[in-house]
Amino acid sequence: TCEIVTLDRDSSQPRRTIARQTARCACRKGQIAGTTRARPACVDARIIKTKQWCDMLPCLEGEGCDLLINRSGWTCTQPGGRIKTTTVS
């Protein structure tokens, strides 16, 4: 299964949690560790190469996915309007 290594979590700011997470997955040829439905998963390597992050389907069902400026990551927008932002480094 995919192994999650949480490197850092910062909850000092109200209503905001910053976490840095790395996932390691045993993937098939042509795939690489990514995020699907908010879970670590093997995704097509072309998604990572082109930075079309929403093509991983990273958000939960019922949410909307949008790319950040410069394709530096993505946002998941919940039906109520709350936004979760993920940046890729």
Epitope: T1, C25, A26, T36, R39, A41, C54, L57, E61, G62
Partner: antibody, heavy 121, light 108 residues
């Protein structure tokens, strides 16, 4: 839900665009596909459009079929239609299920009722 | 391009019997197969994905198995309402995707 529209009787060579209207979910968070079924025959894969708008087509459909989308609709544009294109055309929502080892699998988990295209002279 | 060979094309079974439908892929698809049921005049419905994962709401008499190129859909204790045509769909959305030819299941 998904609802296809635009199917009708056309003559060979006539272009036609089918529309799939999605409601209750965001197209930005799913892939969408088109599948067709000739009368009395099996299901035939046409192509897919990803969240980003990138597309992939079955080899037989390349060049004649084009898939595009807006925030709430997915279109299938068909050109150079022949009698062999007579079929019910379905759109389907494609979700990804994550299984063992983090491997991801396609799930065509929501289908429209289909729209009938008849090509006849 | 990926080819999915589905057998048998049709079968007849009595209520309570076990039914098996096989799909053979032309290349290793790494469990990238899903199974669908279609009744006349209706769209298909998802039964199994990822070779063996049961879709929510599907009766547990349906199961899937296999790996590599060889996959099977099993209906254990078939019921009258299972009369339908069943299709496998093999491959991946970022590569080649192909349906099997279908298996028509008749209940005696």
């Amino acid at each position: 839900s998904l609802e296809e529209s635009g199917g009708r009787l056309v003559t060979p060579g006539t272009p036609l665009t089918l529309t799939c209207t999605a409601s209750g979910f965001s197209l930005s968070n799913y892939y969408m596909g088109w599948v067709r079924q000739a009368p009395g025959e099996g299901l035939e894969w046409i192509g897919i459009i990803y969240a980003s708008g990138s597309t992939y087509y079955a080899s037989w459909a390349k060049g004649r079929f084009t898939i595009s989308k807006t925030s709430t609709t997915v279109d299938l544009k068909m050109t150079s239609l022949t009698t062999e294109d007579t079929a019910t055309y379905f759109c389907a929502r494609i979700d990804i299920g994550v299984g063992d080892y983090g491997w991801a699998y396609d799930r065509l988990d929501l289908w429209g009722q289909g729209t009938l295209v008849t090509v006849s002279s | 391009e990926l080819d999915m060979t589905q057998t048998p094309p049709s079968l007849s079974a009595s209520v309570g019997e076990t039914v098996r439908i096989r799909c053979l892929a032309s290349e290793d698809i790494y469990s990238g197969i899903s199974w669908y049921q279609q009744k006349p005049g209706k769209p298909p419905t998802l039964l199994i994905y990822g070779a063996s994962n049961l879709e929510s709401g599907v009766p547990p008499r349906f199961s899937g198995s296999g790996s590599g190129t060889d996959y099977t859909l099993t209906i254990g204790g078939v019921q009258a309402e299972d009369a339908a045509t069943y299709y496998c769909l093999g491959g991946y959305s970022y590569s080649s995707i192909t349906f099997g030819a279908g298996t028509n299941v008749e209940i005696k």
